[in-house]
């Protein structure tokens, strides 16, 4: 088979491509090359007649093409417009045509890219940086490298402009890295020099070390401050609000009780213009103190917050103990103690975590207990409960609804009827109700501290009695052993019991009968002719009860295997033959007869007077039910003796 191979397939601009012909037939008249996928005279590049060895340029000839005696076509100094399909049309000496199509793609040689940035010193958590890979080149793929790795997946990293632009939103200090871009096309790949992103950040909240806050008289106090910052932070120390010195370390020898107080370290970043401070309270004891509990969250929210209880003061070489509800700590994955047992963390607090909590410091002689601390856990509101649970009321009675939702602080309640606000109370009272008071009653519970709201909606129907139900069916004429039927009791009513009767009896137990949808739907799987019965549904509630009219199921079945009567198969010559065929079927079947395979008549009864031995043979009765689409038959042999 004639084929064209492009060497190479992807061609760089300015280079050359050879459209190499394989399996060129023998005995040729000539051949012609075309731009495109078909023989099109308007797009002929060049024609070549073998006998004359003469090449004739066509309308699409550019002067850059050379045709060879083996039909291959060389295109030199390739330009972008040369991309696409080329068709060779070969005419054999017997004027039989053959053609083959090849193609190649043209791409530019890429220059070395460079990265431009819209922000050389972005500030953490504030600025975005857009890197753009220059220059813009068509049909090029743009790739990015961070620290010589491909881009990590991050919602803060966004590629746009055909991957040419890399945007880092809300830069962080971790974005300080070496960035490179790469341009690729099928003929070249070039990578830029790296650009280092210098993210200005901080200062973070300073850390004062050591963490120890309790000292004995006569010790040296040596505090060091550090805050992550770019450029590095400048530090200042304050004691009880009074400036001390602009150094990273503070040293006070031979301290006394008078050196107790608040020690503040301030870190300042001149480029971001931000200041951050950390305060530590230093206590200098003359003797061991009574412990006390501090909490990082006085009003934690249930299932949201964690609470860290810390036993103060911090004393070196001391054992800390904890009690909850006057018991030692229970084992729980939500309770965590720090390494030194000084901090007890309750993860994801619940309303049961109120306490009381006590901590103790053990010394050589005794255990000093702190005062008990009770947690005020904010929770709820839970889903409100509306009571009483009735949904049907008779006209003329009083409607008194009460709403309650577990909540701390206690919930504030609102009532809405059909979406309209009524009152901001826990109870709703309407006297002497009428049918107009039917509707959607919504109780909304709101916890002002947690900001959470929960609602419960109740449908109230004021009616003297339930309506008469009716039965709807998804299949009025089901086919036996094939179809299922779903009866549904209408209407759908809340707080209503649904009942079913078949032929005046309660439902039989059967794997083919299934109640669903709160007993409102009765499904009969794989119906049988025995299911053709009267079905009644009933609804009842505390006010009234009612039954539907019966619905009779019309099951299509059959035809069953027919029976030919009389059963006799031997007859005497001269007798009358009177055969009757019957098959159980709904609707009634159509009957037809065949004698020895030959169609006779379309009747239920076949009558032949004064039969002879010539009437010997096979008598077949065929039955057909057009509604079920099913057929059946039976064959009987009749012998007539002389």
């Amino acid at each position: 088979k004639l084929t064209i191979e492009s060497t190479p397939f992807n061609v760089a601009e300015g280079k050359e491509v050879l459209l190499l012909v394989h399996n060129l037939p023998q005995h040729l008249f000539g051949y012609s090359w075309y731009k495109g996928e078909r023989v099109d005279g308007n797009r002929q590049i060049i024609g070549y007649v073998i006998g004359t060895q003469q090449a004739t340029p066509g309308p699409a000839y550019s002067g850059r093409e050379i045709i060879y005696p083996n039909a291959s076509l060389l295109i030199q100094n390739i330009i972008q417009n040369d991309t696409g399909f080329y068709t060779l049309h070969v005419i054999k000496s017997d004027l039989v045509n053959e053609e083959a199509t090849g193609q190649f793609r043209v791409y530019p040689e890429l220059p070395k890219p460079s990265i431009s940035s819209n922000n050389s010193k972005p500030v953490e958590d504030k600025d975005a940086v857009a890197f753009t890979c220059e220059p813009e080149t068509q049909d090029a793929t743009y790739l990015w490298w961070v620290n010589n790795q491909s881009l990590p997946v991050s919602p803060r990293l966004q590629l746009s402009n055909g991957n040419r632009t890399l945007t880092l939103f809300n830069v962080t200090r971790n974005d300080t890295a070496s960035y490179k871009c790469e341009t690729q096309n099928p003929v070249s790949a070039r990578r830029s020099d790296s650009v280092i992103l210098n993210v200005l950040y901080g200062p973070d909240a300073p850390t004062i070390s050591p963490l120890n806050t309790s000292y004995r008289s006569g010790e040296n106090l040596n505090l060091s401050c550090h805050a992550a910052s770019n450029p590095p932070a400048q530090y200042s120390w304050f004691v009880n609000g009074t400036f001390q010195q602009s150094t990273q370390e503070l040293f006070i020898p031979n301290i006394t009780v008078n050196n107790s107080g608040s020690y503040t370290c301030q870190a300042h970043n001149s480029d971001t213009g931000l200041n951050r401070t950390t305060v530590t309270t230093i206590t200098v004891y003359a003797e061991p103190p009574k412990p006390f509990i501090t909490s990082n969250n006085s009003n934690p929210v249930e299932d949201e917050d964690a609470v860290a209880l810390t036993c103060e003061p911090e004393i070196q070489n001391t054992t800390y103990l904890w009690w909850v509800n006057n018991q030692s700590l229970p084992v729980s994955p939500r309770l965590q103690l720090s390494n030194d047992n000084r901090t007890l963390t309750l993860l994801s607090v619940t309303r049961n975590d109120v306490g009381p909590y006590e901590c103790g410091i053990q010394n050589e002689l005794s255990v000093d207990h702190s005062d008990p601390v009770i947690l005020n856990v904010l929770y709820g509101p839970d889903d409100p409960t509306i009571s009483p649970s009735y949904t049907y009321y008779r006209p003329g009675v009083n409607l008194s609804l009460s709403c309650h939702a577990a909540s701390n602080p206690p919930a504030q309640y609102s009532w809405l009827i059909d979406g309209n606000i009524q009152q901001h109370t826990q109870e709703l009272f309407i006297s002497n109700i009428t049918e107009k008071n039917s509707g959607l009653y919504t109780c909304q519970a709101n916890n002002s501290a947690s900001g959470h709201s929960r609602t419960t909606v109740k449908t109230i129907t004021v009616s003297a009695e339930l309506p008469k139900p009716s039965i709807s069916s998804n299949n009025s004429k089901p086919v036996e052993d094939k179809d299922a039927v779903a009866f549904t009791c209408e209407p759908e009513a809340q707080n209503t019991t649904y009942l079913w009767w078949v032929n005046g009896q309660s439902l039989p137990v059967s794997p083919r009968l299934q109640l669903s949808n709160g007993n409102r739907t009765l499904t009969l799987f794989n119906v049988t002719r025995n299911d053709a019965r009267a079905y009644v549904c009933g609804i009842q509630n505390s006010v009234s009860a009612n039954r539907s009219d019966p619905v009779t199921l019309d099951v299509l079945y059959g035809p069953d295997t027919p029976i030919i009567s009389p059963p006799d198969s031997s007859y005497l010559s001269g007798a009358n033959l009177n055969l009757s065929c019957h098959s159980a079927s709904n609707p009634s079947p159509q009957y037809s007869w065949r004698i020895n395979g030959i169609p006779q008549q379309h009747t239920q009864v076949l009558f032949i007077a004064k039969i002879t031995p010539n009437n010997n043979g096979t008598y077949a009765c065929f039955v057909s039910n057009l509604a079920t689409g099913r057929n059946n038959s039976i064959v009987k042999s009749i012998t007539v003796s002389a």
Epitope: F29, V49, I91, D94, L95
Partner: antibody
């Protein structure tokens, strides 16, 4: 502009032969193929065969195989079509036509051959 | 052999009308199809080659389209000199075959 000039009308008896000539001018004779096509009264156009003058390669339609001979004389830029064993149904206008890269592009004026006893 | 079927076999139209003639091949012939115009007593004249290419010197009101088995010749605005018989011809197979012709007459 390529021109194909054919020989004049001929009247022939059944069983005889006829030889029709076709002279090319205004273009190179040998950079194409010469086809012969006929049109009998009430019939459509019917291709008979061709020749590539430069190498003498000829091809014929199955229907005329054995009765038709197509030749070319490169020195005079003339092609010939000879049809033998003539019968009355061979009465037709016979055309020579040039075939290049896109099938037939130029036609001769036609030669009427009448076969009658 | 490849059979070529033209339709209609004859057509009446007026000057200025747009006319379309179709040609169907019994098997695919790619774009190896020509359209010819023939006037009484004259040799056929090539109008369209390779299904859609206009032969040099032919007015631009003539156009061809199609590929595979179905082809169309369109005359966008009939001129008095266009009343003639039009033939399609396939050259996919060296047994060149022609359509039976469409006679274009003045209405």
């Amino acid at each position: 502009q390529v021109q194909l000039v054919q020989s004049g009308a001929e009247v022939k008896k059944p069983g005889s032969s006829v030889k029709v000539s076709c002279k090319a001018s205004g273009g190179t004779f040998h950079d194409g193929a010469i086809s012969w096509v006929r049109e009998a009264p009430g019939q459509g156009l019917e291709w008979m065969g061709h020749i590539i003058p430069i190498d003498g390669t000829a091809g014929y339609a199955q229907k005329f195989q054995g009765r038709v001979t197509i030749t070319a004389d490169e020195s005079t830029s003339t092609a010939y079509m000879e049809l033998s064993s003539l019968r009355s149904e061979d009465t037709a206008v016979y055309y020579c036509a040039r075939y290049r890269f896109y099938g037939i592009d130029y036609w001769g004026q036609g030669t009427l051959v009448t076969v009658s006893s | 052999d490849i059979q070529m079927t033209q339709s209609p076999s004859s057509l009446s139209a007026s000057v200025g009308d747009r006319v379309t003639i179709t040609c169907r091949a019994s098997q695919s012939i790619s774009s190896y199809l020509n359209w010819y115009q023939r006037k009484p007593g004259k040799a056929p004249k090539l109008l369209i080659y390779a299904a859609s290419s206009l032969q040099s010197g032919v007015p631009s009101r003539f156009s061809g389209s199609g590929s595979g088995t179905d082809f169309t010749l369109t005359i966008s605005s009939l001129q008095p000199e266009d009343f003639a018989t039009y033939y399609c011809q396939q050259w996919r197979s060296h047994l060149f075959t022609f359509g039976q012709g469409t006679k274009l007459e003045i209405k």
